[in-house]
């Protein structure tokens, strides 16, 4: 028996369902009574789901997994993982045994989009050219860790005094806070880009200072 899985990682959004594809080619006359199917975590060997002795043994993994029972006889051994969590990320191995056995591993990459950044400025009044200001860009509930870029209004990176922190909450999602300290020019735009490297989702916010007053421009 030869087991086939997708080579590319399966990307699943947090709280959605994911399908880990696994297939085998049944011989003529194959019946489910001959099939032993085991899904397990590749690294820890923890059992996730199994089908043995002609029946589905059910989920051994937080009751969030299921097979496709009607498709097993056709060689579809895929696993459905419901309400994906950050902690589900990793490699899963599909073992299929009929007369002989084969196995293959598939990777699950969990992702969550970042919120549109909120921008705050300190101080936020009586601003003058030459003042040192602190601009904070905050974006929430993303996964995995973000890449953060600061650019001016013409797209030129602002690489000076930037401090970025990313903290995981109880669900494993990251809140990003990036702080730019800059000396104000006569006017200018300061833009923050929060990029999810897995989803290639870009969330951005801007602050524009045009002498007075301070403005927060709408999204393009």
């Amino acid at each position: 028996v030869e087991v086939q899985v997708s080579e590319d990682p399966v990307v699943a959004l947090v709280d959605t369902d994911a399908t880990l594809r696994c297939s085998f080619s049944p011989e003529p006359g194959f019946s489910l009574a001959q099939l032993n199917l085991i899904w397990q975590l590749t690294d820890t060997k923890q059992l996730v789901h199994s089908f043995t002795e002609g029946r589905d043994q059910g989920s051994a993994y937080s009751n969030r997994t299921a097979l496709f029972p009607d498709l097993l006889v056709q060689g579809n051994a895929s696993l459905r993982l419901q309400r994906v969590r950050v902690t589900d990320e990793g490699s899963y191995t599909c073992f299929v045994s009929i007369q002989d056995f084969d196995s293959a591993a598939v990777s699950l990459q969990v992702a969550a989009p970042y919120s549109k950044p909120s921008m705050t400025l300190e101080p936020n009044k009586d601003l003058r050219p030459g003042n040192m200001v602190t601009i904070t860009c905050s974006s929430y509930q993303g996964y995995p860790e973000a890449e953060v870029f600061w650019k001016d209004g013409q797209g030129v990176p602002l690489t000076g005094n930037v401090t970025t922190s990313q903290m995981a909450n109880e669900r494993g999602l990251f809140d990003v806070h990036s702080v730019l300290r800059v000396v104000l020019g006569a006017n200018g735009t300061y833009s923050c880009l929060v990029r999810n490297p897995v989803l290639q989702q870009d969330a951005h916010g801007s602050v524009t200072i045009t002498g007075q007053p301070l403005t927060f421009p709408p999204e393009a």
Partner: antibody, heavy 121, light 107 residues
Framework: EVQLQQSGPELVRPGVSVKISCKGS????????MHWVKQSHAKSLEWIGV????????YYSQKFKGKATMTVDKSSSTAYMELARLTSEDSAIYYC??????????????WGAGTTVTVSS | DIQMIQSPSYLAASPGETITINCRAS??????LAWYQEKPGKTNKLLIY???TLQSGIPSRFSGSGSGTDFTLTISSLEPEDFAMYYC?????????FGGGTKLEIK
Amino acid sequence: EVQLQQSGPELVRPGVSVKISCKGSGYTFTDYAMHWVKQSHAKSLEWIGVINTYSGNTYYSQKFKGKATMTVDKSSSTAYMELARLTSEDSAIYYCARGAGYFPYWYFDVWGAGTTVTVSS
Amino acid sequence: DIQMIQSPSYLAASPGETITINCRASKSISKYLAWYQEKPGKTNKLLIYSGSTLQSGIPSRFSGSGSGTDFTLTISSLEPEDFAMYYCQQHYEYPYTFGGGTKLEIK
């Protein structure tokens, strides 16, 4: 018509510096960033860096840090790039190009004709 | 840095034909790829940006497609003035990088 007028060809000795210019016309010069690109036989096109034509904020490709210095003169709508400690590897055509687009994805919508720099003793 | 691999490096075709030029990025650049045309005695011309958006003033026989790592420039019904050098460039992240170029010549 939007145009970028670059300075003429330069023949320079190894070890010296050269400063080339790019004058913008037909648009508000300080509204757009200016990028510089090197074209050589060995490496095709290489992005050197970008300057904010209003603030003077610059960003360089790691490869060209210490080699290129970009400046701008707003009063004459001209961007400059100085190349230091020239060697034969710096012999190339250097282009200026206007940055266009939207945050954060800029591309080059107008190019200069290029300035040929030849380094030879 | 993101590497951009362009193919073929040389292409011969006849007026009226349709040709394709490919560009592959060493990592995903979403849709952010530009195509430029270079001709002797003329300034470089932006043809396509963001993978498939036609720059103002560029004839509709030029089209771009692709996303992620694989992109294509298609020129349908080649005109004599289309024979030139073509470059792709990723505008996803700094430092911006270019493909090695494709020389399109008359067969």
